[in-house]
Interface confidence: medium
């Protein structure tokens, strides 16, 4: 019989008392064979973290800084449930640490040296740890003691709770550095007052501080936020201009065998019965014998953290960077005038081989990182393990939702000014065998389908989006009798046609022979009725252009396109017979890497791009024998985006809307995780 007990870790006598009350009250609202609570008392949160890792307890609620400690080896805990604040309709699980300045002050984030700073308090998240962690590498050496380095960086500060005797500059703007509300510049409101009064030039607070202190929009308009990319934004654009996004209070559990579903079942029932305004006899978010016992008193409920989310993703790149800098005293980034090597993310074995070859040829400018799926690559770029990769539009959408930005676009047409002229896009088409003469767009039900991969543009988002509008449900595996859509659930009928062996069957990488444009076309040739690909796929794999045994004798004339009006046309008439225009593949990266990725890739394509005439004896960046490794093989150059530098602008309103409509059918665990951080 599986153990259905959740052992909650308490860190004080008062918490233990509340935990016992929690345990007793839950017995009446959960079935006797359902989850139950047991209480484990430890001396501190760190002891709780160790106890959970050692399987002596199962759960505890932690602030962000402790979530980071819990994630570090050997603890390896993960966030499983988040407290939320505000309303159920608009639940807030995160706050944003921001740098507020007066509108007319005219300096940027990289010009803070010599300015006067206002902090909520020494050692506090938004007011100290995050800004000082992110500025750590700009601090004058020696950086220890930290307070001295900070004092020498700013020309004067108010950092309540600092030692005014040892570090008088930190108390220059608030004599005495008092560590309570007796100090008018203490806490969030105090730090903002320090800026407002003109004592300081910048205040490090949370996003809500300015709204709580200035009810009038006209007053708020006198202030701006400093962004990490050295721009400024209005104070209400904090979601796009902050130092870090910080989770408020989170339940953690073991990464393996952590009972996360059981913990959620328990807490979901708990909030149903003992949440805000539910019960007089016991209240989950109330602490009669103290403050914030087990859970924050200000919490309104719980949300399940998506399973794909580990602590690094949950805490976010900026927060992890700040805390790691402070804890480890490391400075990972090189000086801004010199770019570190770009860590390219390669999918599985074949891409890794090409990437390694690129790395050798680049003489250290490119390094390679491997992952098994595109989503794993995106996650690695998010958390800094990798820096960049080129993505199909469908994944540009997911990457964008995860905070990454497009930096260069693949161009497929030869032109004099290739690098300066990003193209409008390519065509998504539906290809059938000419011999299957009765097949049209209107009678695809029950047929065998071939897709590049789930979540990709031509192979999935466009055809399935159109299909969804017609059938009004997501059961595409029931619409087609069988198919190959790499990335589908292994037991789905949309994996039945795939050819990968063993664990590689239906995997969304080149280990699955029917993956990608060429793979989907091969699936049509060998097994399927219809393939959803790009307009260049058929000509690129027929007429002897693909020497592989399955393709070498194929003739373009043996294939036709399905048009949306129910007619069919020859392959070359794609401009008048396609499903939609698809945005070109694009290179994505983190915002902080944008300039360096742009610079290094421009250099690399000048060395190894289309200007290389002999690819048999030289490394060619855009060639891989029709396998589309790292980049599409028909790439002519990587083009500047000009002002299309966000995922929405790059993909275009129409495509973003189409993918948004398909969201309800999404099986992307990463998209679910990223929309949890930014709904």
């Amino acid at each position: 019989v599986p153990d259905k007990t959740v052992r909650w870790c308490a860190v004080s006598e008062h918490e233990a008392t509340k935990c016992q009350s929690f345990r007793d009250h839950m017995k009446s609202v959960i079935p006797s064979d359902g989850p139950s609570v047991a209480c484990v008392k430890k001396a501190s949160y760190l002891d709780c973290i160790r106890a959970i890792a050692a399987n002596e307890a199962d759960a505890v609620t932690l602030d962000a800084g402790l979530v980071y400690d819990a994630y570090l080896a050997p603890n390896n805990l993960k966030p499983v449930v988040a407290e939320f604040y505000g309303s159920k309709e608009d639940p807030q699980t995160f706050y944003y640490a921001v740098a507020v300045v007066k509108k007319d002050s005219g300096f940027q984030m990289n010009q803070l040296r010599g300015k006067k700073s206002c902090h909520t308090g020494l050692g506090r998240s938004a007011g100290w740890n995050i800004p000082i962690g992110l500025l750590y590498c700009d601090l004058p050496e020696p950086r220890k003691p930290l307070e001295k380095a900070v004092a020498n960086f700013f020309s004067g500060s108010c950092a309540p709770c600092a030692d005014g005797t040892d570090f008088p500059q930190l108390c220059q703007l608030c004599p005495g550095c008092g560590c309570s509300t007796l100090n008018q510049y203490f806490g969030y409101s105090g730090a903002f007052k320090c800026l407002k009064d003109g004592a300081g030039d910048v205040a490090f607070v949370k996003h809500s501080t300015i709204f709580e202190n200035l009810a009038n929009k006209a007053d708020r308009d006198q202030y701006e936020l400093l962004c990490l990319d050295n721009t400024r934004k209005p104070v209400d654009e904090y979601k796009d201009c902050h130092l870090a996004q910080v989770p408020s209070h989170t339940v953690v559990a073991r990464s393996m065998g952590g009972k996360e579903d059981l913990i959620w079942e328990l807490l979901n029932q708990a909030q149903e019965h003992f949440g805000k305004d539910k019960s007089k006899e016991f209240q989950l978010f109330s602490s009669p014998h103290g403050k914030d016992l087990l859970f924050k008193d200000s919490a309104h409920g719980f949300l399940k953290v998506p399973p794909r989310m580990d602590a690094k993703m949950y805490l976010g790149y900026e927060y992890v960077t700040a805390i790691r800098n402070l804890r480890e005293g490391t400075c990972p980034e090189a000086p801004t005038d010199e770019c570190k090597p770009v860590k390219w993310c390669a999918l599985s074995h074949h891409e890794r081989l090409k990437c390694d070859e690129w790395s050798v040829n680049s003489v250290g400018k490119i390094e390679c990182v491997s992952a098994e799926t595109t989503e794993d690559c995106i996650a690695k770029i998010m958390n800094g393990e990798a820096d960049a990769m080129s993505l199909d539009g469908g994944f540009v959408y997911i990457a964008g939702k995860c905070g990454l930005v497009p930096v260069l676009a693949e161009n497929y047409n030869k032109s004099d000014n290739c690098e300066d002229t990003p193209e409008a896009g390519y065509f998504a088409i539906a290809v059938v065998k000419k011999s299957a003469s009765d097949l049209t767009w209107d009678n695809l039900k029950g047929k065998k389908s071939c897709h590049t991969a789930v979540g990709r543009t031509a192979g999935w988002n466009i055809p399935m989006g159109l299909l969804y509008n017609k059938i009004n449900h997501c059961r595409f595996d029931e619409f087609f009798s069988e198919g190959c859509a790499p990335g589908s659930k292994k037991d789905s009928s949309l994996c039945k046609l795939c050819m990968g062996s063993g664990l590689n069957l239906c995997e969304p990488n080149n280990k699955e022979g029917y993956y990608g444009y060429t793979g989907a076309f091969r699936c049509l040739v060998e097994k399927g009725d219809v393939a959803f690909v790009k307009h260049q796929t058929v000509p690129q794999n027929t007429g002897g252009k693909n020497p592989d045994p399955w393709a070498k004798n194929l003739n373009e004339k043996d294939y036709e396109l399905l048009c949306l009006d129910g007619t069919r046309k020859p392959v070359e008439e794609y401009a008048n017979c396609h499903l939609a225009r698809a945005p070109n593949h694009a290179v994505v990266t983190r915002k902080d890497k944008e300039a360096c990725v742009h610079k290094i890739l421009r250099q690399q394509q000048h060395l190894f791009g289309s200007n290389v005439t002999d690819c048999s004896g030289n490394f060619c960046l855009f060639r891989s024998e029709t396998k589309d490794l790292l980049f599409r093989d028909d790439t002519v150059c990587l083009a500047k985006l000009h002002d299309r530098n966000t995922y929405e602008k790059y993909l275009g309103e129409e495509y973003v809307k189409a993918v948004g409509n398909l969201r309800k059918c999404s099986t992307s665990s990463l998209l679910e995780a990223c929309t949890f951080r930014r709904p």
Partner: nanobody, 128 residues
Framework: EVQLVESGGGLVQPGGSLRLSCAAS????????MGWFRQAPGKGLEGVAV????????YYADSVKGRFTISEDNSKNTLYLQMNSLRAEDTAVYYC?????????????????????WGQGTLVTVSS
Amino acid sequence: EVQLVESGGGLVQPGGSLRLSCAASGHAYGGNYMGWFRQAPGKGLEGVAVLYTGGGSTYYADSVKGRFTISEDNSKNTLYLQMNSLRAEDTAVYYCALALGSARWYTSSLDARAYNIWGQGTLVTVSS
């Protein structure tokens, strides 16, 4: 209005398999106990299998453990019961049920008294 609609019942030989489906509509799926109950001719309601929707625990009656599997598809708001190695004593009308709201529990998850939304039932007959 919350509705549960069962399907998949029928006549099957001993040792055979059937898969029952229960489509839920009219409420936010996830975060409730939902399960399968059965009533054999002349007998009372018996709990067969229950799960906590949205990826939670599963619960089975001893008589079906190892033979029946309860599962869900969140995207379709649908609950399933895969019944293998069927026996004559499994013959019954199978009902899908949902425990909505704040009903107090002093009983097991397989106790029909805690469930307040019921489907119309689907007949399963196991006979050679």
